[in-house]
């Protein structure tokens, strides 16, 4: 006999949220002797059935699967790590990292954490989820559409593997889902921006057209800006942004959104791997989490900080970075971008920790959920009390106390806020003014962390 | 068990060539990037080359460019570099080293051969 | 290139006591999760032999005594308790990108 459930859905719970996580914890705890399958956080590995969909390596891809029979939402993540473009680079990639590039030693289980975590406490967000983890081993930000062989040493399928692992997912409660989320940090997150709107017609096509799909880009968002110091195109680092997907899209096979494809001329789609480009062509709602300023950023802009104080032309550069970032959010209704110096949250433990304007990003998402829930009704006004919209205004590294503790790179000390802004350099009575404020009295409430 | 012996030092005079060599065994060579670092006398540990998995990229320390080549026959497990134009400076110890593919670090070393560049 | 500048040049340490190493690496060398720093041993006349891999993972066969942390662009090698036979030279070295590159060493003598 068919074991009855009975599909909660959260959205609707408003009122004292904290209230009411006691009542299901309390509820779950007591229930918990009776079943007899253990907690288990743990996400099981699934290769490919159709095994020409692949890694650069022709290995199988595949995808990690925690279900939640329960639940009609399915959370789709993928992951990041850089890329190669061309076979210099993704030679040594593959001698060096692998796992990015090939199945061939995944692990069988994966632990879910923050976004991808089970536990409410991890995760008051979407802890009931249908958890999905997509290794990234294609190496070509989830945009490739070529396979290996004689002529192409490595296969570039990252555009494919969501394709097919939403086909095989289909069969394995998928086809009952509401809800669709795909998520993904750093080149998942880009992979998002680009991948979205095609998971959306595939399911479509397919004859799931109530399946709503929705987008979480968490650190993919990147700017196309001038390197503070310009370097040759030599490895994956220190190429500029575009001149790497400019090359890497002719290496890849890279395909884009179709929309966003026929904004710009033959060989210039490169542009469409920016989110301020591609985010105005998106059709799905796409939820946008970008660090102010971002460590990847940083890094293809060939700022390296490495624990010299910064001298003015640097630090010019980085707090300008903020302001252009923040400037192409001004039209995304739902972004969170903490005045941080970071990179990736959304499967960080901590996730939960930075709070933007006094929300936290679990209960932005909870608000956005509630929004587009509520957008059949002609209103257009935010929620009160429920903001979607969190950028900071602050306009330096680190001026959010909630962001992630900073270490000295060469102590390992953690540093407070106004340390670590001496330390980059920072004059505190230009910092104070604008504020209103003494540089001793910035400085105590930096030191409080308020 | 997993083993690299290199072979081919000595004794060459400056401007003079050598061809040194390196046999892997108890390992499937071709799954894993080699390198070549050497030492000179009561120096430091330098990175020279490197050579890809399948052989189709090698990339050079800029101090050596131009006048090493790096090759591979993984049909016979062997990696082979070879010098023209040597100078006193390249009086070392010359190591092999397979690197991991899950982080690059190398977790195996050959006891090394000696070159001695000297008129 | 990515510089790796190692401190102390030379050190002593008594017999069970601790000893400390450091690997500055002059831009981050950390990336997806992982940090591509490693901490080799030589003894004179010896290969050097791998300790630690990924700024922090004990090579197996390396006594527990040595221990590796740090991101981004600074790390730690320590040993602790020190024992006789770890008089050596120790090395970091990164694979972020290449060239690859190696630190200058640190003389580790026990007293």
């Known amino acids: 006999q068919p074991v009855e459930s009975f599909p909660l859905d959260f959205t609707a719970v408003e009122g004292n949220m904290d209230s009411f996580m006691a009542q299901v914890k309390s509820l779950a705890q007591s229930l918990y002797p009776c079943s007899a399958q253990q907690l288990n956080e743990d996400l099981r590995l699934h290769l490919l059935l159709n095994t020409s969909v692949t890694c650069n390596d022709g290995s199988p891809a595949g995808y990690y699967l925690k279900e939640s029979r329960g639940s009609r939402r399915w959370l789709l993540f993928l992951e990041g790590g850089w890329y190669c473009f061309n076979r210099e680079n993704c030679d040594s990639r593959y001698d060096t990292m692998r796992r990015l590039m090939s199945s061939r030693d995944w692990p069988r289980t994966r632990t879910g954490t923050g976004i991808l975590s089970s536990q409410p406490e991890e995760n008051p967000y979407w802890w009931n989820a249908n958890m999905v983890f997509i290794p990234y081993c294609s190496s070509d930000v989830w945009s490739g559409a070529s396979s290996k062989s004689e002529k192409n040493e490595y296969a570039f399928m990252g555009a494919l593997i969501i394709q097919e692992v939403v086909r095989e997912l289909l069969g394995r409660g998928l086809s009952g889902a509401k809800v669709l989320l795909l998520a993904g940090s750093s080149a998942g997150g880009t992979g998002v921006l680009l991948n979205v709107d095609r998971v959306a017609e595939q399911l479509e096509k397919l004859g799931y057209p109530a399946i709503q799909v929705r987008g979480l880009a968490d650190s993919g968002w990147f700017l196309d800006n001038k390197q503070y110091r310009h370097t040759d195109c030599v490895d994956t680092i220190t190429c500029a942004p575009t001149e790497a997907i400019r090359r890497g899209i002719r290496y890849w096979n890279g395909v884009v959104p179709e929309r966003c494809r026929r904004q710009f001329q033959e060989g210039e789609e490169w542009n469409c791997f920016f989110g301020y480009k591609v985010y105005p062509t998106l059709r799905c709602p796409v939820f946008v989490v970008q660090w102010l300023f971002d460590e990847a950023q940083l890094t293809v802009d060939n700022v390296h900080l490495t624990g010299q104080p910064v001298q003015e032309g640097l630090r010019l550069y980085i707090q300008n970075l903020g302001r252009e970032l923040r400037h192409t959010l001004k039209d995304v209704p739902a972004s969170f971008a903490p005045a941080c110096l970071s990179h990736e949250i959304i499967i960080r433990s901590h996730w939960t920790d930075v709070q933007v304007k006094g929300t936290s990003l679990p209960r932005a998402l909870h608000c956005w959920d509630r929004s587009l829930h509520d957008s059949h009704k002609a209103s257009k006004t935010p929620l009160k009390g429920c903001p979607v919209h969190l950028v900071d205004s602050c306009p330096w590294p680190h001026c959010n106390p909630s962001c992630p503790t900073v270490r000295d790179q060469f102590t390992g000390q953690e540093m407070n806020v106004a340390q670590f802004l001496m330390h980059m350099g920072f004059d505190m009575q230009t910092v104070a003014q604008p504020q209103g404020l003494e540089p001793s009295e910035l400085l105590g409430m930096l030191s409080n962390g308020s | 068990d997993v083993q690299l012996l290199e072979s081919g030092g000595g004794l060459v005079q400056p401007g003079g060539s050598r061809k040194l060599s390196c046999a892997a065994s108890?390992?499937?060579?071709?799954?894993?990037?080699m390198h070549w670092v050497r030492q000179a006398p009561e120096k430091g540990l330098e990175w020279v080359a490197y050579?890809?998995?399948?052989?189709?990229?090698?990339y050079y320390a800029d101090t050596v460019k131009g006048r090493l080549t790096l090759s591979r026959d993984n049909s016979k497990n062997t990696l082979f570099l070879e010098m023209t134009s040597l100078r006193s400076e390249d009086t070392a110890m010359y190591y092999c080293?397979?690197?991991?593919?899950?982080?690059?670090?190398?977790?195996?070393w050959g006891q090394g051969t000696s070159l001695t560049v000297s008129s | 290139d990515i510089v790796l500048t190692q401190s102390p040049a030379s050190l002593a340490v008594s017999l069970g006591q601790r000893a400390t190493i450091s690997c500055r690496a002059s831009?981050?060398?950390?990336?997806?999760?992982?940090?591509?720093i490693h901490w080799y041993q030589q003894k004179p006349g010896q290969p050097p032999k791998l300790l630690i891999y990924?700024?922090?993972d004990l090579e197996s066969g390396v006594p527990a005594r040595f221990s590796g942390s740090g991101s981004g662009a600074a790390f730690t090698l320590n040993i602790h308790p020190v024992e006789e036979e770890d008089a050596a030279t120790y090395y970091c070295?990164?694979?972020?990108?290449?060239?690859?590159?190696f630190g200058s060493g640190t003389k580790l003598e026990i007293k």
């Open positions: 080293a397979r690197a991991s593919y899950d982080g690059g670090y190398f977790d195996c």
């Open positions: 108890g390992f499937t060579f071709s799954d894993f990037g």
């Open positions: 050579s890809s998995s399948g052989g189709t990229t090698v």
């Open positions: 831009k981050s060398v950390s990336t997806s999760g992982y940090s591509y």
């Open positions: 990924l700024a922090s």
């Open positions: 070295h990164h694979s972020r990108e290449l060239p690859f590159t």
